[in-house]
Interface confidence: low
Amino acid sequence: NLSQDDSQPWTSDETVVAGGTVVLKCQVKDHEDSSLQWSNPAQQTLYFGEKRALRDNRIQLVTSTPHELSISISNVALADEGEYTCSIFTMPVRTAKSLVTVLGIPQKPIITGYKSSLREKDTATLNCQSSGSKPAARLTWRKGDQELHGEPTRIQEDPNGKTFTVSSSVTFQVTREDDGASIVCSVNHESLKGADRSTSQRIEVLYTPTAMIRPDPPHPREGQKLLLHCEGRGNPVPQQYLWEKEGSVPPLKMTQESALIFPFLNKSDSGTYGCTATSNMGSYKAYYTLNVNDPSPVPSSSSTYH
């Protein structure tokens, strides 16, 4: 004795990415010598058994048996979303519905609002926007490996009434370590299946210079040639250098090159040297105390840096 449910067809809801292919499968245990039929949300018959009813080359027959009717829809569009009905024309007619949800793929995000010539301690605000997602995507920000906490994602319906444009902004104070950093806006959405869809904005930060004096060789001796390199860092890189020997009033101005050269070291060269590195962002003075060692082979570390 067959129960009434044996003639009730069953199917399942399906989710498909726009442009993808969805398979609609309808099954029935007892077909009562009747054929299965699929129709679309507009109630147009797609297939009746193995007979195509709608001229749409995207729709193909996958399986047609007395117990199953499966069809595929390729290149699915957002307009294809809705309830598809599987019917079996028993007495009475029995139906099962499959909700096809079409995911809209978010476009690659666009970052706007970057202003060049950021200075250290300035506040930067960047905006990010991505259109075409369904349901609405989520945007996240990061700077290198560090997550940035932007505003909550704002959602706006696209003109097509089906997809969404999402936007977010992030505000942060820049430091010299941020010079050359990439600020990345990533879009997170189920249609991407974990794939990364992001846009980066490289930022430049202007900051005051620093400098360090490096002796070459590191342990200078009497009679040797010595180069004191004034290594300036900054953005922009320091273009002007001024070497002075301390102790004389005014300090003895020696050269405006980045390296101070002693062709043949004398004991009288001992003393404290200052290098001022200058860019249009400011100046920085580094010091180095030179103690000229005897020409013996025993290394000494009596030279000191400031």
Partner: nanobody, 124 residues
Framework: QVQLVESGGGLVQPGGSLRLSCAAS????????RGWFRQAPGKEREFVAA????????NYADSAKGRFTISRDNAKNTVYLQMNSLKPGDTAVYYC?????????????????WGQGTQVTVSS
Amino acid sequence: QVQLVESGGGLVQPGGSLRLSCAASGRTFSNYARGWFRQAPGKEREFVAAIDYSGGSTNYADSAKGRFTISRDNAKNTVYLQMNSLKPGDTAVYYCAAPASRRPSWDADGYDYWGQGTQVTVSS
């Protein structure tokens, strides 16, 4: 501009009933799922009930099963929450929410649009 407006809250005695309404404007919401959440003072927002776009699929929190009924009238772009046998523990602000999707979700992260909420107080 999308707007969800809840109404129907108020003060009711234990064992009493209330019917909350959630009217949507600014877009066609009939194609989208809808959910009700609530937040009691000092507690996190919690799921109450949800309904899919057609009204054919509903889901309830354990605390709402058998007492609350969610329904919708797509012609009026409105979703309802019929609450019977109310208890003091049901006291909370009740929020209506809609996802940018046809599918109902059972957690707050699945919803993109939220109403301002309506206060329900159950007290004798």
